[in-house]
């Protein structure tokens, strides 16, 4: 969480941002809140980015002002116009690109004063892994697949029964470049699996950590997966 205060001139207002990550090709949110004003027409929201000459987005007098928007963000940004009055200056960024990563500034002007806060935005690709029993293999084998990751993650296997065991000798991980030539499909195979055990396939890069669990018994197979972003710090 980053909390920024106003600069010279009028009174300062508090602006708060939260560092976040964007998934390439999907929509992302750059979070920013501020002390609200009673009149929408008095609120100016500006998003700026380090390394970019023009504005990322500008909202003033109750509407988007696009004439100074930098070409790299054209048609890809929007604020939540109906929530500006309650102090939400968050920016929706459509079709996140790798190059969208960097330092952003949320800059607010209201009748109460001015304020700004920086936000670190990471971009990459992350997806839920799915773990399945590989019935085609000669021995009991598990296959963990996740369709989109970037940068290249690490893959670690763990088991409930053999806690602390190192499975690197009995697993094989491959990374296959996807058609857009940025993200990769992650496939990891674990051999010599025993029944009545829960195995976890953990995929992690500097943006996200995802886990796919599978419990194999004689009567059933149970699966569970979850994904966690690693860098949500407020500012």
């Amino acid at each position: 969480l980053i909390i920024g205060f106003g600069i010279s001139g009028r009174h300062s207002i508090t602006v708060t941002t939260v560092a976040s990550a964007g998934n390439i090709g999907e929509d992302g949110i750059l979070s920013c809140t501020f002390e609200p004003d009673i009149k929408l027409s008095d609120i100016v929201i500006q998003w700026l980015k380090e390394g970019v000459l023009g504005l990322v987005h500008e909202f003033k007098e109750g509407k988007d002002e696009l004439s100074e928007q930098d070409e790299m963000f054209r048609g890809r940004t929007a604020v939540f116009a109906d929530q500006v009055i309650v102090g939400n200056a968050s920016l929706r960024l459509k079709n996140v690109q790798l190059t969208d990563a960097g330092t952003y500034k949320c800059y607010i002007i209201t009748s109460k004063g001015k304020g700004n806060a920086n936000l670190e935005y990471k971009t990459g690709a992350f997806s839920m892994p799915e773990v399945n029993v590989d019935y085609n293999a000669s021995s009991e084998t598990l296959r963990c697949e996740a369709p989109r990751w970037f940068p290249q993650p690490t893959v670690v296997w763990a088991s409930q029964v053999d806690q602390g065991a190192n499975f690197s000798e009995v697993s094989n991980t491959s990374f296959e470049l996807n058609s857009e030539n940025v993200t990769m499909k992650v496939v990891s195979v674990l051999y010599n699996v025993t029944i009545n055990n829960t195995y976890s396939c953990m995929i992690e890069n500097d943006i996200a950590k995802a886990t796919g669990d599978i419990k194999v018994t004689e009567s059933e197979i149970k699966r569970r997966s979850h994904l966690q972003l690693l860098n949500s710090k407020a500012s």
């Epitope: 380090e50 004439s67 048609g75």
Partner: antibody
Framework: QVQLVQSGAEVKKPGSSVKVSCKAS????????ITWVRQAPGQGLEWIGG????????KYAQKFQGRVTITADESTSTAYMELSSLRSEDTAVYYC?????????WGQGTLVTVSS | DIVMTQSPDSLAVSLGERATINCKSS????????????LAWYQQKPGQPPKLLIY???TRESGVPDRFSGSGSGTDFTLTISSLQAEDVAVYYC?????????FGQGTKVEIK
């Protein structure tokens, strides 16, 4: 109201450098880029480059790359354009302007004369 | 880079008559994302900086008389002065702000016939 006040006219020798200043007032200086445009006598308008004052990010026209440096001082709301290795063809009025795209506000211009 | 070409280079028109200036861009300045043309027109009088007249190809800047109008889309644009006044004598420039480097037309000088 928005105002951009530029430094006075300069006479320079070929091979030397010139630094033109542009003091902004009437708006939030850190919010908008400052653009520099020049106009040779009797000629059209030529984009030199611009700067995002809050991050110091500068972009230059390829023609001036390596010869021009645009900077900004947030504390004084002033932008600067320095052009080095001056030649006679650099004789022109140099304008600063608010914004990096649509230019609604211009400085009054600074005449730079390059003569031996 | 986008190149802007204006025609004619100069134009002599009688007071009260219509003046038309054309501007052509080497590639489209129409953005598909917002359907706006990133084109502006400026007026410059001797010894003064340019003054913004029209933006988004056809939106008049506040305070600009309604005898000035802009039209066109994509690559072809026109500035029209419907009834030329003595104070309209100036050089007029079109400018694209679709992408950097910003580019201006070479200018069209408007005089009274």
């Amino acid at each position: 109201q928005v105002q951009l006040v530029q430094s006075g006219a300069e006479v320079k020798k070929p091979g030397s450098s010139v630094k033109v200043s542009c003091k902004a007032s009437g708006y939030s200086f850190i919010s908008y880029a400052i653009t520099w445009v020049r106009q040779a006598p009797g000629q059209g308008l030529e984009w030199i480059g611009g700067i995002n004052p809050i991050f110091g990010t500068a972009k230059y026209a390829q023609k001036f790359q390596g010869r021009v440096t645009i900077t900004a001082d947030e504390s004084t709301s002033t932008a600067y354009m320095e052009l080095s290795s001056l030649r006679s063809e650099d004789t022109a009025v140099y304008y600063c302007a608010k914004g990096q795209a649509l230019i609604q506000h211009w400085g009054q211009g600074t005449l730079v004369t390059v003569s031996s | 880079d986008i190149v802007m070409t204006q025609s004619p280079d100069s134009l002599a028109v009688s007071l009260g008559e219509r003046a038309t200036i054309n501007c052509k861009s080497s590639q489209s300045v129409l953005s598909s994302s917002n359907n706006k043309n990133y084109l502006a027109w400026y007026q410059q009088k001797p010894g003064q900086p340019p003054k913004l007249l029209i933006y988004w190809a056809s939106t008049r800047e506040s305070g600009v008389p309604d005898r000035f109008s802009g039209s066109g889309s994509g690559t072809d644009f026109t500035l029209t002065i419907s009834s030329l006044q003595a104070e309209d004598v100036a050089v007029y420039y079109c400018q694209q702000y679709y992408s950097t480097p910003l580019a201006f037309g070479q200018g069209t000088k408007v005089e009274i016939k």
